[in-house]
């Protein structure tokens, strides 16, 4: 008799999850020779731990503590690119200017970076078939729970000026809803971190107008300076040359705005 | 069985741009970091360069940066190695290599080598 | 970078003998060394990962030991295969780098 499996409203988990975790981890060590000491078998058990044979809408922060101390990985402080809903371009400037980074180039962000996992309670497996999604079913699932703490770690561990790449094109250029908006804008820490500064990437070619007067801009630069951090703002006119600026910026025409 | 297998060797003239393509099977190309060594006629080794596949990630040693591209195609399991404005002293035997899962960061796995000659 | 001096150059011993190569590192690479066997119009093969395990298939008489800065590659007992050249390899830090290699002929 086939045994009566919960159907979520999110896709299911992401096939190949145990071997694309594995194998991005062994990846990771390889590129990142500082982070060799991490035994990747480990890793996978502690994150296996973190929602195996447990509810997918009762996951805890405590239950990725493991995985956590496991991936315990130093960053420059003053070197933290945060983003909301811009990845690929933050994932692009940081390839160029290998000094920053955002979380995705850290071991556990790396891991996890576009996956999709959950359990069942009491059985030892994995959920294929769907997964919880954070609106229409629970919050306190183990991806969104996973998310929630490495950002907030992320974001404790940020020191002077940290940056944050906004992407000028949707409605809401800041969300408070998002993960930037939710957790690290609250998790930065005053007595460590001097200022915040936003680029507000501009999405089409003859968008002049100054996206850091946006409302949702300001609001944002009012929640920063109630946490007494000091805020600015930059548009960055031309992502494409912006770019091409960070790996050429001897270039005659980086001069002028980008 | 994991192999490489690496596309056939060229002959360029100086200033010329040449790009080896290294097919890969028995494995899941996104599962490992892909590596490029340089042999200069009856020399040494030397790495150039590495990819992750999964992201296009890539580092270039500092001797190569500017003139070395490493890109990879994941519909066709297929890293790529460019080098270009060739000169006589890029004449040399150019392989793709990777580590293995029992071997630390050694490389179990090579292409069979591409040889690029580079003469007027 | 660091650098890989390895020692000798070249060789000649006679079949049955006890063969030790060299490498020094430029600075610490904790065990991070592999030793490769490279025969002429072929890729290099890898014999040594992490500066003595012996890679899967690779005879007893291919050995390696050291750890830091200094490096040994040894074969026990020479045998007329082994003719070929050998290569240390750091891979501790990026970029990699090899040794110059060592040359082994038959006497």
């Known amino acids: 008799v086939p045994r009566w499996r919960q159907q979520w409203s999110g896709p299911g988990t992401t096939k190949r999850f145990p071997e694309t975790v594995l194998a991005r981890c062994v990846k990771y060590t390889e590129i990142h020779p500082e982070m060799r000491h991490v035994d990747c078998q480990s890793v996978w058990d502690a994150f296996k731990g973190a929602f195996i044979s447990k509810h997918p809408c009762n996951i805890t922060e405590e239950d990725y503590q493991p995985l956590m101390k496991l991936g315990t990985q130093t960053v420059p402080c003053n070197k933290i690119l945060l983003w909301s809903r811009i990845k690929d371009l933050a994932h692009q400037f940081t390839q160029v200017q290998r000094d920053m980074f955002t979380l995705e180039d850290t071991l556990l962000g790396y891991l996890a970076d576009d996956l999709t996992w959950c359990g069942e309670f009491n059985t030892s497996k994995i959920n294929y078939q769907s997964c919880p999604d954070w609106r229409k079913d629970c919050s306190n699932n183990p991806v969104s729970v996973f998310w929630k703490t490495v950002s907030r770690r992320f974001a404790e561990a940020a020191c002077d000026v940290v940056h944050v790449m906004l992407n000028g094109s949707r409605s809401k250029i800041f969300d408070k809803n998002s993960t930037f908006g939710s957790v690290e804008v609250h998790n930065l820490q005053p007595e460590k971190v001097q200022t915040l500064e936003a680029w507000v990437i501009h999405g089409g070619r003859e968008d002049s107008r100054d996206l850091c007067q946006d409302p949702t801009i300001k609001e944002l630069e009012s929640i920063i300076s109630k946490r007494n951090i000091q805020f600015s703002c930059k548009n960055i006119y031309r992502p494409d040359k912006f770019l091409q600026c960070v790996k050429n910026p001897e270039d005659s025409s980086c001069t002028s705005e980008i | 069985e994991v192999q490489l297998v690496q596309s056939g060797a060229e002959v360029k003239k100086p200033g010329a741009t040449v790009k080896i393509s290294c097919k890969v099977s028995?494995?899941?190309?996104?599962?490992?970091?892909m590596n490029w060594v340089q042999q200069h006629p009856g020399k040494g080794l030397e790495w150039m360069g590495w990819?992750?596949?999964?992201?296009?990630?890539?580092d270039v040693a500092e001797k190569f940066q500017g003139r070395v591209t490493i890109t990879a195609d994941t519909s066709t399991d297929t890293a790529y190695m460019e080098l270009s404005s060739l000169r006589s002293e890029d004449t040399a035997v150019y392989y793709c290599a990777r580590t293995g899962y029992n071997s630390g960061y050694g490389f179990p796995y090579w292409g069979q080598g591409t040889t690029v000659t580079v003469s007027s | 970078d660091i650098q890989m001096t390895q020692s000798p150059s070249s060789l000649s011993a006679s079949v049955g003998d006890r063969v030790t190569i060299t490498c020094k590192a430029s600075q610490n690479v904790d065990s991070d060394v592999d030793w490769y066997q490279q025969k002429p119009g072929k890729a290099p093969k890898l014999l040594i990962y992490?500066?003595?395990n012996r890679y899967t298939g690779v005879p007893s008489r291919f050995s390696g030991s050291g750890s830091g800065t200094d490096f040994t590659f040894t074969i026990s007992s020479l045998q007329p295969e082994d003719i070929a050249t050998y290569y240390c390899m750091q891979s501790n830090t990026h970029p990699r780098t090899f040794g110059g290699g060592t040359k082994v002929e038959i006497k």
């Open positions: 028995g494995y899941t190309f996104t599962d490992s970091v």
């Open positions: 990819i992750d596949p999964e992201y296009g990630r890539t």
């Open positions: 992490k500066a003595s």
